[in-house]
């Protein structure tokens, strides 16, 4: 069964900067990626980005940089303009499409112990699993 | 302007083959994924095959698998349905779609259909 | 495969009324259904997709809402041209599954 895995790590540099790395385990071909805080997109979460593997990638506020790391996972950068780091309490979720297969969607958050500048092992939340 | 017309429909034995053709106009058909959907008589719809951008990745219904194969090509804006080992239960008004990535892969265009009748 | 239960069959109303579709999948699909009409002699063309967004030119008195596995299609106020069947569909999962579909007749 596919997979996906989300990742969410601080930038040492600057604490108000933040970074989500998601990736889709499994065969297939990924057609669309979309990126979402507070929640699935949908069900109560922002869209904060839509990436395609050939039409390009459209991002929102406050996403910095959206791009494909590599066929199947990508980074998001996010700019937070707060002094209070709202990103640090938040769920980030990806959910990838893959035709003619379908979506996988996992959704995670920074963890609460980590150091900045310390890379957080990935700790997918799987949501939704359709074989559940 | 977008168009696709499915051609190829008839009255055939039990048993027998069709070979189905829709022919795509009006957009870049190789950026595109598409399928192939039945509307039974019961006016029920099917989705019978499917077959990604590049043609690598195929889904038949379970019904239809190992009697049917999706193919397309691309030099051609061409999907094609072959159909073998025809059954009664193949009786229906067969549509191509095409699947746009970013509504979800909702179809937003579909041909006008062609009818394929299985008769024993 | 995800089964998409859609009801009622049939709806018989009048011009000017609000009318609501629902449709309850088996399993979780998230976002990931679409709203389809078929006008009579016609092939299915899109109105909605990802629950309420709505396609090129589909008038804003259709509406799509839920997530999950429970979603509601309605016409706010029905006109005479909505005379059609209407039919959802999932895509989160293949294969890509219709619901049964709803036949709105016009008094």
């Known amino acids: 069964t596919p997979e996906v895995w989300v990742q969410v790590q601080m930038e040492a540099t600057e604490l108000s900067s933040f970074t989500v790395h998601c990736g889709f385990l499994g065969p297939g071909s990924i057609s669309l990626v979309t990126v979402s805080w507070g929640g699935p997109d949908g069900a109560g979460g922002t869209k904060l980005a839509v990436l395609h593997p050939e039409l390009g990638t459209r991002q929102w506020a406050p996403a910095r940089q959206a791009r494909w790391e590599t066929q199947s996972s990508i980074s998001l950068a996010l700019e937070d303009s707060g002094a209070s780091s709202p990103f640090a309490n938040t769920t980030f979720c990806c959910k990838f499409a893959s035709f003619p297969e379908g979506s996988w969607e996992s959704c995670g958050s920074l963890p609460p112990s980590s150091d900045p500048g310390l890379s957080a092992p990935p700790t997918p939340v799987p949501i939704l699993r359709a074989d559940l | 302007d977008v168009k696709l017309v499915e051609s190829g429909g008839g009255l055939v034995k039990l048993g027998g083959s069709l070979k189905l053709s829709c022919a795509a106009s009006g957009f870049t058909f190789s950026s595109y994924h598409m399928s192939w959907i039945r509307q039974t008589p019961e006016k029920r719809l099917e989705l019978v095959a499917a077959i990604n951008s590049n043609g690598i990745n195929t889904y038949y219904l379970d019904t239809v698998k190992g009697r049917f194969t999706i193919s397309r090509d691309n030099a051609k804006n061409t999907l094609y349905l072959q159909m073998s080992s025809l059954k009664s239960e193949d009786t229906a008004l067969y549509y191509c779609?095409?699947?746009?990535?970013?509504?979800?892969?909702?179809?937003?265009?579909w041909g006008q259909g062609t009818s394929v009748t299985v008769s024993s | 495969s995800i089964v998409m239960t859609q009801t009622p069959k049939f709806l018989l109303v009048s011009a000017g009324d609000r009318v609501t579709i629902t449709c309850k999948a088996s399993q979780s699909v998230t976002n990931d259904v679409a709203w389809y009409q078929q006008k009579p002699g016609q092939s299915p063309k899109l109105l909605m997709y990802?629950?309420?967004n709505h396609y090129t030119g589909v008038p804003d008195r259709f509406i799509g809402s839920g997530y999950g596995t429970d979603f509601t299609f309605t016409i706010s106020t029905v006109q005479a041209e909505d005379l059609a069947v209407y039919f959802c569909?999932?895509?989160?999962?293949?294969?890509?599954?219709f619901g049964g579909g709803t036949k709105l007749e016009i008094k």
């Open positions: 569909q999932q895509a989160y999962r293949s294969p890509w599954t």
């Open positions: 990802y629950v309420s």
């Open positions: 779609a095409r699947h746009e990535d970013y509504y979800g892969f909702a179809m937003d265009y």
